[in-house]
């Protein structure tokens, strides 16, 4: 037994161009938290597969509000370590997923909303009891810097936390054949209880008489390497001294995957794809249960209905995946009609409708003129999701409440003078011009080049523009 510890050092924009936008804003302050998921071996399982070694969530970080115009800095982090306890032996090789989550603290109805900001993953070798290992991972334009280690919980010691230490029974020395438990020199290694001959380097046991192999080793005593790397002769026989497999057969020959798992060769090893309910390097471990807390984002965990399915997560609205770890982008289905803006609040969808439309999905076209009055004899005209008034002469504005100055736009051409009139405007034209707006020149012989003046009006007379 032991604890995997993860220390996040920084999360912020990575080097190079294309710095990401800050995930928070003055309108939507937010804070970060992290999730770590550990799986044994070097499996490349999908992100939603069970975190067989364990998972942990960090505390929430400090609330952050973007400074307008400033690039996204390293974002404020939660305090403390993420700790993932493991009950069994430390596998030596493990896969990790570290997710950076954003908790929005705006005025969403129903509380904060969560969204996945970045996810990094990797596979590592790590001996328990070793120093902190530092790492940098990039996800898009974001960069995550962190350190991690695995440490054993007493009385376990060793690189796999499989050796047990006990306080000395005698003050001066340990019992026959038993060594001091470095670095705990005042304790002694507990008597071996594994199967006789079980490899001390590559095997371990948790029950008396058993011999379980670390990743990369097989055989009843864990003395046979899975890879053929120690065979010298390309086509030679198996070597009893080195415990070497006959080259030729691949790592999947004989199917090392238990419980119906299927084997595939990887570039240097093999990988088992396990049926539901089983995990581990060789699908040898079963039974993730609701007690392991496998459902994220408020998913409800219930026991599976069949033996192969140890649990089922019932996800809250807005999340999906076998562990409710995927946020559903419900706005991608464009549910808001008539140009409405879609807002996914996590617990619900909201459509912000354009003027003239209403309803949960902006599906109702409002009667634009219903209850709308146009003043001063104006008439309401519907169209385009917004009402407008066609105003009587002398009035203007959205509701025809403003008295219009018809001369403000200087409508009389060629130096004509404008006079406001109860029914519009009148242009008094300068000599040589005529027309409602003084737009037509008068020919020297008295004839107009354009339509004749209305009867009863001489060129030069004031003309009323109706």
């Amino acid at each position: 037994a032991g604890v995997f510890e993860l220390q996040i050092h920084s999360f912020g924009p990575g080097p190079g161009p294309g710095a990401p936008r800050s995930p928070c804003s003055a309108r939507l302050p937010c804070r970060l938290f992290f999730r770590v998921c550990l799986k044994p071996g070097l499996s490349e399982e999908a992100a939603e597969s069970p975190c067989a070694l364990g998972a942990a969530l960090s505390a929430r970080g400090p609330v952050y509000t973007e400074q307008p115009g400033a690039p996204a800095p390293d974002l404020p982090l939660p305090d403390g370590l993420l700790q993932v306890p493991f009950r069994d032996a430390w596998p030596g090789t493990f896969s990790f997923i570290i997710e950076t989550w954003r908790e929005e603290l705006g005025d969403q109805i129903g509380g904060p909303a969560w969204s996945l900001l970045a996810r990094v993953a990797g596979r590592r070798r790590l001996a328990a009891g070793g120093p902190w290992a530092r790492d940098i991972q990039r996800a898009g334009a974001w960069e995550l810097r962190f350190s991690y280690r695995a440490r054993c919980e007493p009385p376990a010691v060793g690189t796999a936390c499989t050796r047990l230490c006990r306080p000395r029974s005698a003050p001066s020395r340990c019992g026959p054949g038993l060594r001091p438990c470095a670095p705990l020199e005042d304790e002694c290694e507990a008597p071996l209880v594994c199967r006789a001959g079980c490899s001390p380097e590559h095997g371990f046991c948790e029950q008396p008489g058993e011999c379980r192999c670390l990743e990369g080793w097989t055989g009843p005593l864990c003395t046979v390497p899975v890879s053929t790397s120690s065979c010298l002769s390309p086509r030679g026989p198996s070597s009893a001294t080195t415990g070497c497999l006959v080259p030729g057969p691949g790592p999947c020959d004989g199917n090392p995957c238990a419980n119906g798992g299927s084997c595939s060769e990887t570039p240097r090893s093999f990988e088992c794809t396990c049926p539901r309910g089983f995990y581990g390097l060789r699908c040898e471990v079963s039974g993730v249960t609701c007690a392991d807390g496998p459902c994220f984002n408020g998913g409800l965990c219930v026991g599976g209905a069949d033996p192969d399915s140890a649990y089922i997560c019932h996800c809250p609205p807005g999340f999906q995946g076998s562990n409710c770890e995927k946020r559903v982008d419900r706005c991608s289905l464009q549910p808001c009609r008539n140009g409405g803006l879609c807002l996914d609040l996590g617990h619900a969808l909201r459509c912000r409708c354009r003027a003239g439309f209403a309803g949960p999905r902006c599906e109702h076209d409002l009667d634009d003129c219903a209850g709308r009055a146009c003043a001063n004899g104006g008439t309401c005209v519907e169209g385009g999701g917004a009402h407008r008034c066609s105003c009587a002469l002398g009035f203007g504005g959205r509701d025809c409440r403003e008295r219009a100055d018809p001369c403000a736009a200087r409508p009389c051409a060629h130096g004509g003078r404008c006079y406001a009139h109860f029914s519009g405007l009148v242009c008094a034209c300068a000599p040589g011009y005529m027309g409602a707006r003084c737009e037509f020149p008068v020919h020297p012989d008295g004839a107009s080049a354009l339509p004749a003046a209305p009867p009863g009006l001489r060129p030069g007379d004031p003309q009323r523009y109706l």
């Epitope: 070097l42 490349e44 570039p267």
Partner: antibody, heavy 124, light 106 residues
């Protein structure tokens, strides 16, 4: 500077065995994490991975060709040899060798340097 | 076997265009690798581990994706970018390539 170069016969008769040698410089197959692979490309067609070998002699072969392929290395000579038995006209292709780098000694990081390739024609 | 399907198989574009090539794997892979090949030349590594630019590759190239769907993007095509592009998976043997996408000058 890392370079790889393929050598071997340019013409092979059907049923014969093809032996190709990849001679490389700028890295060593005694270095942990290093590997060399073979890839081929029939004229006008896509790339096909054939086999690779790692610094610690772990080997992988394409399942469809496994019975015909053997890959070996000579670390002291900086060479990797691929033999392919029972050649057929459909094996006519340009054969490339390439350096492969593993990260964490377990998974491929990149196949980052390639030889110029050698065209092998199978014809009677 | 994991089948790799690239789309489109060929495409015509102009200098300065933004071009996207997709690669779909028949089952989930952790990482994608992209290569560029010009006629009569060996392939050249462009992108490794899905989104990392190989040494000497211009920053106009970028890679993204996860699971079964991956993308190679060229933000602004240059004359030297007209070539055939291949994706590849290293998840399980056989370590397959896509059928290629030929990028031609419009």
């Amino acid at each position: 500077q890392i370079t790889l170069k393929e050598s071997g016969p340019t013409l092979v008769k059907p049923t014969q065995t093809l032996t190709l040698t990849c001679t490389f410089s700028g890295f060593s197959l005694s270095t942990s994490g290093m590997g060399v692979g073979w890839i081929r490309q029939p004229p006008g067609k896509a790339l096909e991975w054939l086999a690779h070998i790692w610094w610690d002699d772990v080997k992988r072969y394409s399942p469809s060709l496994k019975s015909r392929l053997t890959i070996t290395k000579d670390t002291s000579k900086n060479q990797v040899v691929l033999t392919m038995t029972n050649m057929d006209p459909v094996d006519t292709a340009t054969y490339y060798c390439a350096r492969i780098v593993s990260f964490d000694n377990d998974h491929v990081s990149a196949m980052d340097y390639w030889g110029q390739g050698t065209l092998v024609t199978v014809s009677s | 076997d994991i089948q790799m399907t690239q789309s489109p198989s060929s495409l015509s574009a102009s200098v300065g265009d933004r071009v996207t090539i997709t690669c779909s794997a028949s089952s989930s892979v952790s990482y994608m690798y992209w290569y560029q090949q010009k006629p009569g030349k060996a392939p050249k590594l462009l992108i490794y581990l899905t989104s990392n630019l190989a040494s000497g590759v211009p920053s106009r190239f970028s890679g993204s994706g996860s699971g079964t769907d991956f993308t190679l993007t060229i933000s602004s095509l240059q004359p030297e970018d007209f070539a055939t592009y291949y994706c590849q998976q290293w998840r399980s043997n056989p370590f397959t390539f896509g059928q290629g996408t030929k990028l031609e000058i419009k």
